[in-house]
């Protein structure tokens, strides 16, 4: 898990036609913020969606020489405290040499230190750096002391997760080495790394390490901003957890963030022992993610499950997309806390109706006004079939208001489904007593017409999943659709001529390819009588025409051909392209029909097994 | 070679939209950023957005980020230009460019496709 | 937005001469300059990027200079191909944005 030395081996590729031992980093514009160029980084040219240009420097532990292209010439190497200097950290050098610690970096020993670059210590509050100065044998002593470890640790040896004792006191040092090549130290990014001594190894780190002792609870607890939290915290007996040994990572709401909340929202979640553990572990991730690490989107588990998408735009970290961190990096003993202003509410703690997200809206509104909201007891468990919202034609819209609640009762289960509970066949009734078939297909999930898209989610009391129709209960069965359709007289009355009718009319899953009145235009009467005469050979077309199983069209993955056999015995062969069906490699007329028991595609061929 | 191959001009109604393409061959398509341009007839450059086809992230100009849309296909390695609410004012050349690695600005630019929006 | 202003919009010289094109940046935009030529009818063609690097067959006599707001084009030896339009572009921060061209 070596990925400080993997990203830099990448940058090293990436400035190698610069010279030998050239490092390509990049830097956002308008800051002083370098970074090892990762592959993802080098392509995208961009780091928290900031646009980056590329620098040449030499790789660590190489300088230029005069005349000569790249770094052809290595580092001299030096004690500890003489290696602050070389890698320019020299306000950490001259602090050594006020505080007493150069004769001990000078001597005998093994150390690392993480060093604070220059501009680390300009950002420390001044209050806190006066009073530094003002006592350096003591407190700038002991700052430093709890920079430094007392054996030699190269980056690889700072495995991610580690809690290292600091030279002052045993504080341990909370090491972070993550995936994109960033290593931490209680959130300070080592931004120079490995610079070799006799006596050890120098990194510089991009801020001042401030001693800690307490632990998330302790921060929680002693921090007047975070009362609505704490209180939420008790109540669902979360507290107390953040107390123990980890390395959690807190997004903490203030109390503004509890304010934004409606009244009524927080205090259902807050009644409900279930919903409201929930909402508390949807803030806490079980790693450690510092500021720092962060270098685009990247989706971690929370407690509660669920996952949550961190990401940053410019200094800015981002959750679920939206800047709402006000304080980074308050780190602890058991961890970091990142404040936030608005309060993350995962979908386990929604009511159903909550979790209907933009493309659903006309379904939601549709829901309120036709007072089918108040239905949907926060008690009862249901499930949502909600249709995206172009689904909604306007003749559908100005239906009449009491058509209209019949056709939404068809989207609602009386029980709570989730995605993973749904299977071919399955019998799912509504609140209005409907009954409506599931069909499940390789990259499919279909009710009755209409085929589920991404987004399906479970909240408190239900879970909804989405939909790309309105869907429609078939009402009649496959005689029943055939004999009402004159286009499809022929048809039947070859299906009735070969003793096949009853078929039809029993309950059953079944696929019609049902030949319009047109496909038998250009036969002779002579070649009809044939067809009735041989009443085996008839039989033999008519059953080529029906397949066992209900097959949708738009339950099939676009582009690929679908083999079924027939009853018949013959295979035939369907294709979805472009919301067209293929038959046989002939357009269909019109596709899925929905009957009672199975679904009619139309062709204007009749279709002959091979 | 890299090659960008814009397809035909388009002439529409106002109000319409049309959808331009723009189809790389030659190089790792999903690896860099493609630009759109605009130029007005006698007139100079304007960057309208781009799009990264790696994970479809998108950049845009404020003045033209509800006429322009931008899509990527990596199956088809082509790039797409929504433009929506069609008026005079659009009626332009339309370039792609592939921007390319390290430092360097767009390098390989397609030939153009010419949209006249007329009644 | 940050606006590349190329002052002088039209430009006279003669085949043999140098002449230099300037283009000036609102704001900071470091070294992420880069300069077109377009010729009536073609697409742009791209002659220097990073402020000073020329683009492959780019010939030498096109140089470009600069960084931080200050932005020049030099073409030295100046052939009759070389008569036409030239824009300059900054890409060091979103939205990119092009000088108004200098003919």
């Known amino acids: 898990n070596n990925h400080y030395d993997k990203i830099l081996a990448h940058s090293r590729i990436r400035g190698r036609d610069q010279g030998p031992n050239v490092c390509a980093l990049q830097q956002i514009l308008g800051t002083k913020k370098k970074y090892f160029s990762t592959c993802k980084n080098w392509y995208k040219k961009s780091i928290c969606g900031q646009k980056t240009t590329v620098l040449y420097e030499c790789c660590p532990g190489y300088m230029r020489m005069e005349g000569m292209k790249g770094c052809p010439a290595v580092l001299p190497i030096d004690h500890v405290y003489g290696t602050l200097g070389i890698v320019g950290a020299t306000t950490t050098q001259r602090y050594s040499d006020a505080s007493k610690l150069r004769e001990e970096i000078e001597g005998k020993g093994s150390f690392t230190y993480f060093a604070p670059s220059n501009e680390a210590w300009d950002n420390l509050d001044s209050d806190i750096r006066r009073g530094l100065e003002s006592n350096v044998n003591v407190e700038l002593l002991n700052a430093l002391h709890s920079h430094m470890i007392n054996k030699r640790m190269l980056t690889k040896d700072l495995k991610n997760g580690m809690i290292i004792p600091s030279m002052y006191n045993n504080l341990g040092l909370f090491i972070n080495h993550y995936p994109n090549g960033v290593v931490t130290v209680n959130c300070a990014r080592i931004i120079h790394g490995n610079q070799i001594a006799t006596n050890g190894v120098v990194h510089v780190i991009d801020r001042v390490l401030t001693q800690i002792g307490t632990s998330i609870q302790d921060f929680i607890e002693a921090e007047d901003d975070l009362s609505s939290f704490r209180a939420a915290a008790i109540t669902s007996d979360i507290l107390e957890a953040l107390g123990r040994d980890g390395h959690f990572t807190l997004f903490a709401p203030t109390n503004e963030a509890f304010e934004k909340l409606p009244r009524g929202v927080l205090e259902r979640i807050m009644g409900d022992k279930v919903a409201s553990e929930a909402l508390m572990k949807y803030h806490i991730l079980n790693t450690l993610q510092c500021s720092e690490s962060i270098m685009g989107g990247a989706v971690f588990e929370t407690l509660e499950g669920n996952t949550i998408e961190i990401g940053c735009d410019g200094d800015s970290i981002t959750v679920n997309g939206i800047k709402m961190v006000n304080k980074k990096d308050i780190v602890t003993n058991n961890g970091v806390i990142h404040l936030i202003d608005q309060v993350l509410i995962p979908d386990s703690a929604k009511q159903v109706i909550e979790l209907a997200g933009k493309q659903q809206t006309t379904f939601t509104d549709l829901v309120a006004q036709l007072g089918l909201a108040s239905a949907l007891r926060p008690d009862g468990e249901y499930t949502l079939l909600a249709p995206v919202n172009n689904a909604f034609s306007d003749d559908t819209l100005s239906m009449d208001q009491r058509l209209l609640k019949l056709i939404l009762q068809n989207h609602i289960l009386k029980v709570k489904v989730g995605l993973n509970e749904l299977y071919n066949g399955q019998i799912l009734e509504t609140i209005g007593g409907k009954q409506l078939r599931v069909f499940v297909y390789r990259t499919a999930v279909c009710i009755e017409n209409s085929c589920m898209e991404k987004g399906s989610k479970q909240g408190r009391n239900g879970a909804i999943h989405i939909f790309r129709e309105i869907i429609k209960p078939a009402e009649k069965s496959l005689h029943e659709k055939l004999k009402q359709d004159k286009r499809f007289s022929t048809f039947l009355s070859l299906l009735e001529a070969a003793d096949l009718k009853e078929l039809l009319t029993q309950p059953g899953d079944w696929t019609l390819f049902v030949p319009t009145n047109d496909a038998f235009k250009g036969m002779t009467s002579e070649e009809k009588e044939i067809l009735i005469r041989d009443k085996n050979a008839l039989q033999n077309i008519i059953l080529y025409h029906l397949t066992p199983g209900v097959f949708i069209g738009k339950g099939f993955e676009p582009g690929v051909t679908n083999i079924l056999k027939t009853t018949q015995g013959s295979k035939i062969f369907l294709k979805e392209v472009n919301d067209t069906l293929l038959v046989n490699e002939l357009k269909s007329k019109e596709s899925d029909i929905m009957t009672t028991n199975g679904v009619i595609h139309v062709v204007d061929k009749l279709l002959y097994p091979a | 070679q890299v090659q960008l191959q814009q397809s035909g001009a388009e002439l529409a109604r106002p109000g319409a939209s049309v959808k331009l393409s723009c189809k790389a061959s030659?190089?790792?398509?999903?690896?860099?950023?493609m630009q759109w341009v605009k130029q007005r007839p006698g007139q100079g450059l304007e960057w309208i957005g781009a799009?990264?086809?790696?994970?479809?992230?998108?950049r845009y100009t404020q003045r033209l980020k509800g006429k322009a849309t931008l899509t990527a296909d990596k199956s088809s390695s082509t790039a797409y230009m929504e433009l929506s609410s069609l008026a005079s004012e659009d009626s332009a050349v339309y370039y792609c460019a592939r921007e390319g690695e390290g430092n360097s600005a767009m390098d390989y630019w397609g030939q153009g496709t010419s949209v006249t929006v007329s009644s | 937005d940050i606006v590349m202003t190329q002052s002088q919009k039209f430009m006279s010289t003669s085949v043999g001469d140098r002449v230099s094109v300037t283009c000036k940046a609102s704001?900071?935009?470091?070294?992420?300059v880069a300069w077109f030529q377009q010729k009536p009818g073609q697409s742009p063609k791209t002659l220097i990027y990073s402020a000073s690097y020329r683009d492959s067959g780019v010939p030498d006599r096109f140089t470009g200079s600069g960084s931080g707001t200050d932005f020049t084009l030099t073409i030295t030896n100046v052939q009759s191909e070389d008569l036409t339009d030239y824009f300059c572009l900054q890409y060091g921060t979103y939205p990119y944005t092009f000088g108004g061209g200098t003919r």
């Open positions: 030659g190089y790792s398509f999903t690896h860099y950023w």
């Open positions: 799009i990264y086809p790696g994970d479809g992230d998108t």
């Open positions: 704001q900071n935009v470091g070294s992420s």
